[in-house]
């Protein structure tokens, strides 16, 4: 059916809109566009005759319309008046007419809004502030953002005036944030510049950072003072009661034991006139220098090289510590520490050994950490993978293959077809393939640093016809009530229908059967012994239909609870006892017997000649299936009576 799609549907003034025609009939004489919902000569915009390729403007033509040979209409420099319906009138070669109507709406581009405020310097826990979003605009939605997030839910925040006004009651220092308002209509959304609310408060009691009070000789002392305050506090430092400087930070390089003492920070708020102080006591100890790591091999090759990391400097009577990935060393036969723990050796490095590695020197107060060291392990390339996984393509399509191999440094790629080099790129593209493009496609990945190369070969067949399919399985011997089995119909080909049959019948409806991957994969969940049937897949495309050979599922099950036969439990003295045990199981189970708990023989049949009352007791048959790992058993009580003492007793075999 002929339809018109407006792209976009909501149009901004000054922009353009395309009235896109879908399902245009073939064999056309021409077509015309009209403003409105019907064909009206007075409102014709433009007409087009296919035979002459002539476009003729109509009364409603504004000079902003362009008609395309596919009948689509482009209207440029849109104005508000363009809103509404547009009708396409199509005249087919047989002079039968078709009509379709589309529409779009025009909206103005919104101006950038701004925020006005009724109080520029509110005081914490005292004042309220009202923000208003300007200008007031019809058909616009107003939104507010605090620190680029939508408004939090708070009883102190209130929206009014159609969301144009945001009021903050009883402001706190936490309301000191970036406020923006936004106006929206269907074609535009504009945000104001941010307005920062300036709440006056403080100063609070200052905090001195860092918190640690113990330092090494030779370190730099860098203390920072901060007190929450608006306007920002003015800071002063005192050491042992003596004024030092009026700065927020106190910096003393290369400190000595003499720099130990009490350090006072004073914060002052010029607006409130308040002062607050905090004192910290600093102790300076004589200490070793910061450690660092040296390596005997900065670019080791995976599975070939060992790396020895050494913690410097060497200091007598010092404890050395190591960390990998910010964790203590894992237990691994590939990680070796020297007697003094100063050297960490990684034997036969792998790509997972990159680190980071840190060493530390322990002293009486703390542990000094080295800077982290990362190993650049050279590896690969691994076997490249070629995607997509299709092996069959139909003539006329584009062939686009991508190759990837894990490698450090990244691999360099080459493509060969039937052994002939094509190009040195990661992707291979051949347009409009034919049968002649069938062949062996080789991706070669090369690692320039290790000098290693790996290749993957993919056979690609370009054919309208598909080959005989085959079924691959992810589990050849599934266990009953435990395993799932996924059958996949090979090969994977584009534009192909995949079908399945079980024992020559179409698939039964079952929650345990699931088709996926475009019906190419059939999964049986929680297999049962009844699933041990013949599975066939079929493939069908435009020119061919074919079926796989059947695959019979071998479900391992059991052993079920065994049965001992004969069922008799009473025997006469002197009879032969011949008990047979059977349990349903795949594969066949192993049998063993116990009499009164004492192991007997590992046979399916238990035979005792000329039994006596001494043979009374419990006879247990044990079955075990090594493939399923399951066991089962049954116990039978046997009573042997002295000859002739009781009627109805079995004479035995």
């Amino acid at each position: 059916k002929l339809t018109i799609e407006s792209t976009p549907f909501n149009v901004a003034e000054g922009k353009e809109v395309l009235l896109l025609v879908h399902n245009l009939p073939q064999h056309l004489f021409g077509y015309s566009w009209y403003k409105g919902e019907r064909v009206d000569g007075n409102r014709q915009i433009i007409g087009y005759v296919i035979g002459t390729q002539q476009a003729t403007p109509g009364p409603a033509y504004s000079g902003r319309e362009i008609i395309y040979p596919n009948a689509s209409l482009l209207i440029q420099n849109i104005i508000q008046n363009d809103t509404g319906f547009y009708t396409l009138h199509v005249i087919k070669s047989d002079l039968v007419n078709e009509e379709a109507t589309g529409q779009f709406r025009v909206y103005p581009e919104l101006p950038k809004p701004s925020i006005s405020s009724n109080n520029s310097k509110p005081v914490e826990d005292k004042d309220a502030v009202a923000f208003t979003c300007e200008p007031e605009t019809q058909d616009a939605t107003y939104l507010w953002w605090v620190n680029n997030q939508s408004l939090p839910v708070s009883p102190r925040l209130q929206l009014s005036n159609g969301n144009r006004t945001l009021t903050l009651f009883n402001v706190t220092r936490n309301d000191t944030a970036s406020y923006k308002c936004e106006t929206q209509n269907p074609v535009s959304a504009r945000r104001s510049d941010s307005v920062i609310l300036n709440v006056l408060y403080g100063p609070d009691a200052p905090t001195i950072s860092p918190l640690n009070t113990s330092y090494r000789s030779g370190e730099n002392l860098n203390l920072s003072c901060h007190a929450a305050s608006n306007p920002p506090a003015q800071y002063s430092w005192f050491v042992n009661g003596t004024f030092q400087q009026s700065t927020q930070e106190l910096f003393i390089p290369n400190i000595t034991v003499n720099n130990s003492g009490s350090y006072t920070c004073q914060a002052h708020n010029s607006d409130t006139g308040l002062n607050r102080t905090t004192v910290t006591t600093i102790t300076v100890y004589a200490e070793p220098p910061k450690p660092f790591i040296t390596s005997n091999n900065s670019n080791p090759v995976e599975d070939e090289d060992a790396v020895a990391l050494t913690c410097e400097p060497e200091i007598q009577n010092t404890t050395y510590l190591w960390w990998v990935n910010n964790q203590s060393l894992p237990v691994s036969p590939r990680l070796q520490l020297s007697n003094d723990n100063r050297t960490l050796t990684l034997l036969s490095v792998t790509r997972n050994d990159v680190g980071p590695y840190e060493c530390g020197i322990q002293n009486e107060l703390s542990v000094d950490h080295s800077d982290p060291v990362i190993l650049n392990v050279l590896y690969g390339p691994d076997d490249p993978t070629i995607s997509p996984s299709y092996t069959y393509y139909r003539p006329g399509v584009n062939l686009s293959l991508s190759c990837h191999a894990a490698s450090n440094p990244p691999a360099q790629y080459s493509w060969l077809i039937d052994g002939n080099i094509q190009q040195h790129t990661q992707e291979l593209f051949i347009s409009n393939i034919t049968e002649k493009n069938s062949g062996l496609y080789t991706c070669q990945a090369n690692n320039s640093a290790s000098g290693h190369s790996r290749t993957t070969v993919k056979t690609i067949t370009v054919s309208a016809e598909l080959p005989k399919p085959s079924i691959s399985s992810n589990n050849s011997k599934p266990v009953e009530d435990k395993d799932a089995v996924a059958f996949t119909c090979e090969p994977e080909a584009q534009n192909t229908t995949y079908l399945w049959w079980v024992n020559g019948q179409s698939l039964p409806v079952s929650p345990r059967l699931q088709l996926s991957n475009g019906n190419r994969t059939l999964t049986l969940f929680n297999v049962t012994r009844n699933d041990a049937r013949a599975y066939v897949c079929g493939i069908q495309n435009s020119v061919s239909a074919n079926r796989s050979d059947p695959v019979t599922l071998d479900v391992l099950y059991g052993p079920d609870t065994p049965i001992i036969s004969p069922p008799d439990s009473s025997y006469l003295s002197g009879a032969n006892l011949n008990l047979s045990c059977h349990s349903a199981s795949n594969p066949s189970p192993q049998y063993s017997w116990r009499i009164n708990g004492i192991p007997q023989q590992h046979t399916q049949v238990l035979f005792i000649a000329k039994i006596t009352p001494n043979n009374n007791g419990t006879y247990a048959c044990f079955v075990s299936n090594l493939a399923t790992g399951r066991n089962n058993s049954i116990v039978k009580s046997i009573t042997v009576s002295a000859s002739g003492t009781s009627p109805g007793l079995s004479a035995g075999a």
């Epitope: 003539p395 054919s463 309208a464 079929g538 020119v543 074919n546």
Partner: antibody, heavy 120, light 106 residues
Framework: QVQLVQSGAEVKKPGASVKVSCKAS????????MHWVRQAPGQGLEWIGW????????EYDPKFQGRATMTADTSISTAYMELSRLRSDDTAVYYC?????????????WGQGTLVTVSS | EIVLTQSPDFQSVTPKEKVTITCSAS?????MHWFQQKPDQSPKLWIY???NLASGVPSRFSGSGSGTDYTLTINSLEAEDAATYYC?????????FGQGTKLEIK
């Protein structure tokens, strides 16, 4: 069971067009590609092309491209093959044909054929 | 396009005799398919994918071959086998048929 029933014989003049229909029953026409094959009197089989009734995709033998048009109306399970600008050597029996895996075995079904005679 | 050439064009054979029809393709194909057609009847798929007998086809028929050379064999001809046999390739567009081999019973 699966059946393909074609329209009756046609006699046409050179330059005219003919439209042969093929009504399917016993299966969903959308699930199978419909092929068209013709056979001139006393001659062999000649493939014309196929249509996918589900989406209207077609593939033609280049020698029929531009003259043959295959269409389908899935609502009435019918496929059509129209051949225009007929010539006397277009005189042939025209068959519709499907290749399907509706059973576990590939099956091939053919219409009974439509004889088109082109004569002045 | 791929040209299929059947040999022979015509063969007159006595019942119980073994019959071999060959089909040679101008370019290698994946499979060959064979059709049987009797006078005033539509063609019937006879052998699909080179060697698989279609439903209802007697076991005296067999198919073989690969690449460019394919064969249809009737082990012991029977009267009902009198017909024209066509090979067809579906590997490449356009699909093509051989010119046909007519079998006649002596």
């Amino acid at each position: 069971q699966v059946q393909l029933v074609q329209s009756g014989a046609e006699v046409k003049k050179p330059g005219a067009s003919v439209k042969v229909s093929c009504k399917a029953s016993g299966f969903n026409i959308k699930d199978n590609y419909m092929h068209w094959v013709r056979q001139a009197p006393g001659q062999g089989l000649e493939w014309i092309g196929w249509i996918d009734p589900e989406n209207g995709d077609t593939e033609y033998d280049p020698k029929f491209q531009g003259r043959a048009t295959m269409t389908a109306d899935t609502s009435i399970s019918t496929a059509y093959m129209e051949l225009s600008r007929l010539r006397s050597d277009d005189t042939a029996v025209y068959y519709c044909n499907i290749i399907t895996m509706a059973t576990p075995y590939p099956m091939d079904y053919w219409g009974q054929g439509t004889l088109v005679t082109v004569s002045s | 396009e791929i040209v299929l050439t059947q040999s022979p064009d015509f063969q007159s054979v006595t019942p119980k005799e073994k019959v071999t029809i060959t089909c040679s393709a101008s370019t290698s194909v994946i499979y060959m398919h064979w059709f049987q057609q009797k006078p005033d009847q539509s063609p019937k798929l006879w052998i699909y994918s080179t060697s698989n007998l279609a439903s209802g086809v007697p076991s005296r028929f067999s198919g073989s071959g690969s690449g460019t050379d394919y064969t249809l064999t009737i082990n012991s001809l029977e009267a009902e086998d009198a017909a024209t046999y066509y090979c067809q390739q579906r590997s490449s567009y356009p699909l093509t048929f051989g010119q046909g081999t007519k079998l006649e019973i002596k």
